[in-house]
Amino acid sequence: MAVTACQGLGFVVSLIGIAGIIAATCMDQWSTQDLYNNPVTAVFNYQGLWRSCVRESSGFTECRGYFTLLGLPAMLQAVRALMIVGIVLGAIGLLVSIFALKCIRIGSMEDSAKANMTLTSGIMFIVSGLCAIAGVSVFANMLVTNFWMSTANMYTGMGGMVQTVQTRYTFGAALFVGWVAGGLTLIGGVMMCIACRGLAPEETNYKAVSYHASGHSVAYKPGGFKASTGFGSNTKNKKIYDGGARTEDEVQSYPSKHDYV
């Protein structure tokens, strides 16, 4: 039961995280004009990964896309790349994890296959989350650097008379959305990896060896004493009271502990 819960929760958390990463990537408020000592401004600037916007106090908002590719800073391109890689990996991870969910039956997919898919999606979520966190952090670092540079040149004198006030930018809402979303995706990935351990079959796939007792036939299957994963009850040695010896392949239809989770 705990395995399914962990897997399901991991999926949901990752789903929310990836939705957040997509939202952050599309948002315009990656950097917003720093209002420092001027909380009310007639012209408010904010920028995203794809366009920059200006909101006037009149209520009119104008956004302009970055129509150049080569003219953009390398750091911005890197952030875009990281966020897109994060989204793509996350989307593939979600697709894989849907088929890996224990609560969804697809043909006669074995638990080992589901475990592998769960692990794969978990790793994808972890990398996706890390990409998002890295992207947002690179952008935040760029902002901090530019903020202090523009603070140093806050007023650049022109002929000693005219002042040019430089627009300083600070963290926008998208950064916080990105950090939280990346963290959630990462947590969801870790949960999927943990769930994978509980999904993996606990017996080594050896052929059962038959021991013919004098009273009645009992097939003993060795390798049953494996360390408990902590999910569900520990599997004891399975005894198959069947009157005759059988191989592992012949006893597949017998219930395993995973059917009762």
């Epitope: 007639a42 012209v43 600037n45 916007c53 006037e56 209520g59 104008e62 627009t167």
Partner: antibody, heavy 118, light 113 residues
């Protein structure tokens, strides 16, 4: 069409207060900031402040913060400016105005002439 | 506060002449976010409220004749009337729309001979 209607004149005594009105019509009143501007002969135009009829947010020119109080009545699409502790310096024409693209004042009321005299 | 300085304070011209008037601001009115200058021109005829002519330094308000042209960037701006008409008799004001408090120039009075 857009109209901002203001009463023509107000005659008040020194030390008293006056509440000027500006009735808006021809547009969605709650969508635009309403600004107030003072004009005194020989002193040009001075921006007093602004109010948003929907959020009631205000922003004042520090010079007029203790002099003017801006309010609105959404139901009647009317903006008000109360001027307190009036002196001869407050004798002027007061305009209400709406802002649009570029924060430009695209429509102006006809102005209310305030005369402070004993 | 941004100080707006207009020159000349008055101009006397004959109808049909080309007129230019200047407006300087103490701080740049250029916004890098949208590459626009937040400077507005108004004119005020005797006994009337000011009327919007040009915003964003050079964008004409609808209904304003094309003889009115705004130019300039940063701190130096110019209003040009290509061929002055008798009805252009007015006081011309420039205004900072970039930061609060909004401030106006002292005006240029245009008189027709």
């Amino acid at each position: 069409q857009v109209q901002l209607q203001q009463p023509g004149t107000e005659l008040v005594k020194p030390g008293a207060s006056v509440k000027l009105s500006c009735k808006a019509s021809g547009y969605t009143f709650t969508n635009y900031w309403m600004h107030w501007v003072k004009q005194r002969p020989g002193h040009g135009l001075e921006w007093i402040g602004m109010i948003h009829p929907n959020s009631y947010s205000t922003n004042y020119n520090e010079k007029f913060r203790s002099k003017a109080t801006l309010t609105v009545d959404k139901s009647s699409s009317t903006a008000y400016m109360q001027l307190s502790s009036l002196t001869s310096e407050d004798s002027a024409v007061y305009y209400c105005t709406r802002i649009y693209y570029g924060n430009a004042m695209d429509y102006w009321g006809q102005g209310t002439s305030v005369t402070v005299s004993s | 506060d941004i100080v707006m300085t207009q020159s000349p304070s008055s101009l006397t011209v004959t109808a049909g002449e080309r007129v230019t008037m200047s407006c300087k601001s103490s701080q740049s009115l250029f916004n890098s976010g949208n590459q626009k200058n937040y400077l507005t021109w108004y004119h005020q005829k005797p006994g009337q409220p000011p009327k919007l002519l040009i915003y964003w330094a050079f964008t004409r308000e609808s209904g304003v004749p094309d003889r009115f042209t705004g130019s300039g960037s940063g701190t130096d701006f110019t209003l040009t009337i290509r061929s002055v008409q008798a009805e252009d008799l007015a006081v011309y004001y420039c205004q900072n729309d970039y930061s609060y408090p909004f401030t106006f120039g002292s005006g240029t009075k245009l008189e027709i001979k």
